[in-house]
């Protein structure tokens, strides 16, 4: 058993049918010694008397808010949550496996640049009685500070007969050095509590591996005289690290016909312009990627050929 926060305790339970459970001793936070009784949740049934209460925690029915009273007055509360292990594996019921980039991916994180700011998100089908707490650091043995905000509900989607909820959190490394080579990974830890169930999820990454630039901005077409060719130009996204001479991007320019089946013409360039043939009803799209490290491509920025 360990304390999650004041008056909230997590009991780690290795569960299997007929498991003996965990013996837990609760102590009433009072100088009183006599006439103390204990109850669970809203029930008036007296579970025991005395300054301490010993319980055998075998299942969620044994968790909840234990209260000690004296003469009708509440003395203190202890909320017991369960962290359940089954077949040697901690439960992961609260969050949905996003399965990308691999199975058992519950947290996904992205950074728009090398400033040490990043966003993580996760999915759940649970709509109520749900709280999240996020902590982060660089390295784990001698951790350096990363400050995370509160997790917020960022999107709701309907998937079949299921509603899916996306939560996200923004974090900032306290003393980020954008140009430095990373040697220790960022660690992100999410505590999830649903009703009386506690679970924790972790992710470990280097900022360089989660970089995904914003799409190029100010995408423009300039027709070339007496030609079907156009000059496409764009700019680095505002959110990308500076100076651009050091934090350089490479770009992919794509000409796509109206039909998805039509052949795509693609050009790769380190410049912020390119000359392409603009077909009728086609569109031109440009995306960006870190020039020196193969992390994710940005989403496409697009303009119609006409």
């Amino acid at each position: 058993i360990w304390e999650l926060k004041k008056d909230v305790y997590v009991v780690e339970l290795d569960w299997y049918p007929d498991a003996p459970g965990e013996m837990v001793v609760l102590t009433c936070d009072t100088p009183e010694e006599d006439g103390i009784t204990w109850t669970l949740d809203q029930s008036s049934e007296v579970l025991g008397s005395g300054k301490t209460l010993t319980i055998q925690v075998k299942e969620f029915g044994d968790a909840g808010q234990y209260t000690c009273h004296k003469g009708g007055e509440v003395l203190s509360h202890s909320l017991l949550l369960l962290h359940k292990k089954e077949d040697g594996i901690w439960s992961t019921d609260i969050l949905k496996d996003q399965k990308e980039p691999k199975n058992k991916t519950f947290l996904r994180c992205e950074a728009k640049n090398y400033s040490g700011r990043f966003t993580c998100w996760w999915l759940t089908t649970i709509s109520t009685d749900l709280t999240f707490s996020v902590k982060s650091s660089r390295g784990s043995s001698d951790p350096q500070g990363v400050t995370c905000g509160a997790a917020t509900l960022s999107a709701e989607r309907v998937r079949g007969d299921n509603k899916e909820y996306e939560y996200s959190v923004e974090c900032q490394e306290d003393s980020a050095c954008p140009a430095a080579e990373e040697s220790l990974p960022i660690e992100v830890m999410v505590d999830a509590v649903h009703k009386l169930k506690y679970e924790n999820y972790t992710s470990s990454f280097f900022i360089r591996d989660i970089i995904k630039p914003d799409p190029p901005k100010n995408l423009q077409l300039k027709p070339l005289k007496n030609s079907r060719q156009v000059e496409v130009s764009w700019e680095y996204p505002d959110t990308w690290s500076t100076p651009h001479s050091y934090f350089s991007l490479t770009f992919c320019v794509q000409v796509q016909g109206k039909s998805k089946r039509e052949k795509k013409d693609r050009v790769f360039t380190d410049k912020t312009s390119a000359t392409v043939i603009c077909r009728k009803n086609a569109s031109i799209s440009v995306r960006a990627q870190d020039r020196y490290y193969s992390s994710s491509w940005s989403e496409w920025a697009s303009v119609p050929c006409s």
Epitope: W15, P17, D41, E59, F60, G61, G64, E86, D93, T125, I126, G160, D161, N162, K163, H194, K195, L196, K197
Partner: nanobody, 123 residues
Amino acid sequence: EVQLVESGGGVVQAGESLRLSCAASGRSFSNYEMGWFRQAPGTEREFVGTISRRGSSTYYADSVKGRFTISRDNAKNTVYLQMSSLKPEDTAVYYCAAGQLFPSSHSRDYDYWGQGTQVTVSS
């Protein structure tokens, strides 16, 4: 919302068997742990057993262990309670319930309940 409808109750002799079904509709059935409870006249609702959302784990009250078996078919959105070696003290209204905490014998941990089906075991 999840709607639950129990069926399969009836009158049987002591020692006989009976299978109860609980059909769920509404939100995704496979997101819920399913439980069975029972209530005899003049008594509190009593936990019978529960099955995890994937059907891989079950948990039973001592009073029914070895006699009752819970199973589920997520493709059919149905949970079953197979009762054998029935005793007169098994007479009760049987309720199916859906929750999100497994295992739990506490009715507080179940969010949705059926209307119940009567089982009577005569001696």
